[in-house]
Interface confidence: medium
């Protein structure tokens, strides 16, 4: 069978499974004169043989783990043993079978984890090796937690990355681990080959002892600080501590105060830097942050609460320079004249703001002193001794002392004695007829003038008239303003009129005095008037139930998913058709009838969130009036962006020859959402072949260091592939390339002869 098992001498590659006893020849080479015999050289390992006539075979089972490729040469010789053809390369690739079990590098691992550590952040790696080919399932390892001891309420506190062996806390572990309750745990971890998928896989186990350490990064108790402290500042008020020394502490004022009177030192001690004033601000909430040496937050911020304790540093204040009250001539003893309400800026409902009232002087003292009394705590003035006479004394002036426990303030009250209120207001007409208005009449319009008169003393509370609508306007669409000089009432529109809900309103007005009527006098029909308001229809645009509609969905929702809905009603009851405006990205469609909004394309938070479009509601029929509202779609992040280099790193170079191993630092980023702590990338070399020359080590969640392992580099450009994993759900990996040039240097810069100006590296390492 020419071609498959026999043929002329030429370079060839054969694949043979390891572990199999020889069952057939590999190949029969045919000699072309003057060649008569064949010779085999190279990595034969005394397994591969060629007979003089050209029959290539092997004499015992191969072992890929001893040698995965045998590089052989076959030459054709003439009768004198001189090579007349070849030698040509013959490559034997040994194919892997699963003949090696995985083994852990250690039979026991020990590690520690801090309580409340971030879920999913590895704190320990277990590592197993398998001599089989990692490019096949035979060498693909799968890690699993077999058991966790103790197991509380059947809840796993630990998890393992099946591929990397990274052990981290679960969300429950992050929340519930407590060294005071359980300081140590034991895990039994298994590793299987065949990617864990086959019943025929080999396995190994190891034991992991985990110590739980206390997390001392905790919010301190709320602090109370007395205002106006005269002690020397700054004063230490509390402290925070990161779990290890060397953290850089700072305070964050979320309220963005113009004056932020707190500071923190590099031990985590928190100080108030100046006296506080409770009346300016009675409580502060701010955050303490701990960062690493690169300025990356080490954990979540702690909330610090400071309550400012009151001292009595404010005197009572009067409501106005002079407070004026009126009292009718005939009022009886004990009647209330009015209440003086003084204020105190100190803390409410405490002794510091609790006020006492006392009359210290009455002028004139006619017909006697002590005509008035004031309730000590309420400040209510009452008539104390007798009814007053206007012709004797039309006005009294009182000096009232208002005091808290430390301060006294004098307030002044003027009491005007006025005529008795024995006349009621009388409307000039009892019926103001009909008034027809369109429903779109402007708010603030005066639609009617009404007038009542009162024969009591002018410009007193006995003759002043207040108009009230007592019937026919339960919605409060109308109001009445009174001119204090003429007692004219102006009926105005306060809220939009509405034909659909109130086409005809029978309005009733009442005219009253602010002063009480004397005993025996009552308001009667003369103090009431009416009018009829007729509202005519105006075709109005539909009305949305909200100015802004908001919905929240994950950015990876399937096309066709309902993402929200809007509703509008037409005042005239017409049907409504919905449409979208400003859907610049073409992501959405709206159901014209129901107002439901659906996705019609893949959404992308990184393109911008929230996504804002306008929704339009249009009358069907009629005059096709329309209204516009906003729809805001908030897109929640999913991990859909692999890490990449944060900037362009072309132009990195080392001066050749290297005198010592060198290193350079690079930064990664990705476009997904990273909350307070930022990304937590892991870094590794992109291919195994790079490991002899380079190593990559993580500095923090975003930065890593690429170092040379030796100094024996050629004078050329090397492209170093680096794998960056974001550890997200699901984890995404980016492979980036860092081009590093080794070049002759002049004064620390790459030297290029003339004519070699392209791509000159610009950054020396």
């Amino acid at each position: 069978q020419e071609g498959k098992f026999s043929g002329p001498l030429k370079p060839m590659t054969f694949s043979i499974y390891e572990g199999q006893e020889p069952s057939q020849i590999i190949f029969q080479f045919k000699a072309n004169p003057p060649a008569v015999t064949f010779e085999l050289t190279g990595e034969t390992d005394n397994i591969f043989v060629i007979e003089r006539e050209g029959l290539l075979y092997y004499n015992r089972a191969l072992d890929r783990e001893t040698r995965s490729t045998h590089n052989l040469q076959v030459a054709a010789l003439d009768a004198n043993g001189i090579i007349v053809e070849g030698p040509v390369p013959i490559t034997i690739k040994v194919k892997d079978i699963n003949d090696n079990r995985p083994t852990f590098l250690q039979s026991k691992y020990e590690g520690s984890v801090r309580q409340n550590s971030r879920p999913g952040k590895p704190f320990l790696y277990v590592n197993a090796t398998d001599l089989d080919d990692p490019a096949t399932p035979n060498g693909q390892l799968y890690y699993q937690i077999v058991i966790q001891l103790p197991m509380i309420n059947n809840v796993m506190y630990f998890q393992i990355n099946n591929k990397t062996g990274a052990i981290s806390l679960t969300r429950e572990g992050s929340q519930e681990l407590n060294p005071a309750k359980n300081p140590s745990y034991n895990l039994v971890i298994s590793v299987k080959d065949m990617g864990g998928q086959s019943e025929n896989s080999f396995s190994d186990t190891t034991s992991v002892d985990i110590i739980v350490t206390e997390n001392i990064w905790k919010a301190p108790k709320p602090v109370e600080m007395v205002e106006n402290s005269t002690d020397p500042h700054p004063i230490k008020i509390t402290q925070v501590r990161w779990n290890d020394p060397g953290a850089q502490y700072s305070l964050v004022d979320k309220e963005k105060l113009p004056r932020f009177p707190f500071s923190i030192d590099q031990e985590g001690d928190i100080y108030v830097t100046q006296p506080l004033d409770r009346e300016e601000k009675d409580a502060y909430v701010f955050y303490a942050v701990a960062k690493d040496e690169y300025g990356k937050p080490l954990s979540y911020p702690l909330e610090i609460h400071v309550k400012v304790k009151d001292i009595n540093d404010n005197p009572p204040t009067c409501p106005s320079p002079v407070t004026v009250f009126e009292v009718q001539e005939n009022e009886r003893l004990g009647n209330s004249i009015g209440t003086l309400t003084a204020h105190d800026r100190d803390e409410e409902n405490t002794a510091n703001s609790f006020l006492n009232y006392r009359i210290v002087e009455q002028t004139p003292k006619l017909p006697m002193d002590g005509l008035f009394l004031i309730q000590t705590y309420a400040g209510m003035l009452q008539l104390a001794k007798q009814s007053l006479k206007k012709q004797d004394t039309p006005q009294y002036n009182l000096t009232i002392e208002v005091s808290d426990k430390d301060f006294k303030t004098l307030c002044f009250v003027q009491i005007n004695v006025i005529d008795i209120n024995d006349q009621i207001p009388i409307f000039e007409k009892s019926d103001y007829g009909n008034l027809t208005l369109a429903e779109d009449t402007n708010i603030g319009s005066t639609i009617l003038t009404i007038q009542a008169t009162d024969a009591d003393e002018p410009f007193t509370g006995s003759s002043k008239i207040l108009y009230h609508i007592i019937k026919g306007d339960s919605e409060g669409r109308l109001g009445v303003d009174t001119d204090p000089h003429t007692n004219t009432g102006y009926v105005i529109i306060k809220k939009p009129l509405d034909f659909e809900t109130a086409a005809v309103s029978n309005i009733v007005f009442k005219a009253e005095n602010p002063e009480p009527l004397v005993f025996g006098v009552k308001y009667n029909a003369s103090s009431f008037a009416k009018f009829t308001l007729i509202v005519t229809d105006v075709n109005e645009a539909p009305q949305f139930s909200q100015h802004v509609f908001q919905a929240k969905v994950s950015e990876d929702v399937a096309i066709g998913t309902k993402v929200g809905n809007v509703t509008a009603k037409d005042p005239e009851g017409l049907d409504i058709s919905y449409s979208l405006r400003g859907d610049t990205r073409g992501w959405l469609k709206i159901d014209h009838v129901t107002g439901e909004i659906f996705s019609v394309a893949p959404l992308d938070r990184e393109a911008g969130s929230p996504y804002r479009v306008q929704v339009v509601a249009t009358e069907v029929g009629g005059s096709s009036l329309s209204s516009v509202s906003e729809f805001h779609l908030i897109l929640m992040d999913v991990n859909d962006n692999p890490p990449r280099l944060a900037k362009d790193y072309t132009g990195l170079f080392f001066c050749h020859p290297l005198s010592a191993p060198g290193s350079l630092i690079f930064e990664a980023t990705d476009d997904d959402q990273h909350l307070f702590r930022g990304p937590h990338f892991t870094f590794s070399l992109g291919s195994g072949s790079l490991q002899n020359d380079w190593e990559v080590s993580k500095i923090n969640g975003t930065h890593a260091r690429l170092s040379t392992r030796h100094t024996e580099f050629e004078e050329r450009e090397y492209v170093v592939l680096i794998r960056i994993n974001d550890g997200g759900r699901p984890p995404l990996e980016g492979i980036v390339s860092l081009p590093v040039t080794f070049c002759s240097c002049v004064e620390g810069s790459c030297f290029r002869p003339a004519g070699h100006q392209t791509g000159i590296p610009t950054v020396g390492m």
């Epitope: 350490t213 001392i216 020394p245 060397g246 031990e267």
Partner: nanobody, 118 residues
Framework: QVQLQESGGGLVQPGGSTRLSCVSS???????MGWFRQAPGKEREFVAL????????EYSDDVHGRFTVSRGNTQNSVNLQMNNLKPEDTGIYYC????????????WGQGTQVTVSS
């Protein structure tokens, strides 16, 4: 290896006084130093703690007002002056280096015996 070396203690009459000293073989920035004790048949308990700067001291309720913790001649040493001793103060006294309070001990001394008895 870093070591803590305690000295002092021994047999003391009730009502009497003694002074314990502790020196660390290395200076720890930002770490606090203090004392713990373990009475026979009991768990080790907190006694006193001195902040790294030496400006804050903390005591257990049992010893407050009787014991005083102070910095030694150097930044890496700490003393415990024990006055008005009671029989219940008997135990092994351990020097400790902590960070962030009494519950986070990072390094223990070997301990020194204090016996209060007539």
């Amino acid at each position: 290896q870093v070591q803590l070396q305690e000295s002092g203690g021994g047999l003391v009459q009730p009502g009497g006084s003694t002074r314990l000293s502790c020196v660390s073989s290395r200076t720890f920035s930002y770490y606090d130093m203090g004392w713990f004790r373990q009475a026979p048949g009991k768990e080790r308990e907190f006694v006193a703690l001195l902040s790294w700067r030496g400006n804050n001291a903390e005591y257990s309720d049992d010893v407050h007002g009787r014991f005083t913790v102070s910095r030694g001649n150097t930044q890496n040493s700490v003393n415990l002056q024990m006055n008005n001793l009671k029989p219940e103060d008997t135990g092994i006294y351990y020097c400790a280096v902590t960070y962030g309070g009494a519950r986070s001990v990072r390094l223990w001394g070997q301990g020194t015996q204090v016996t209060v008895s007539s």
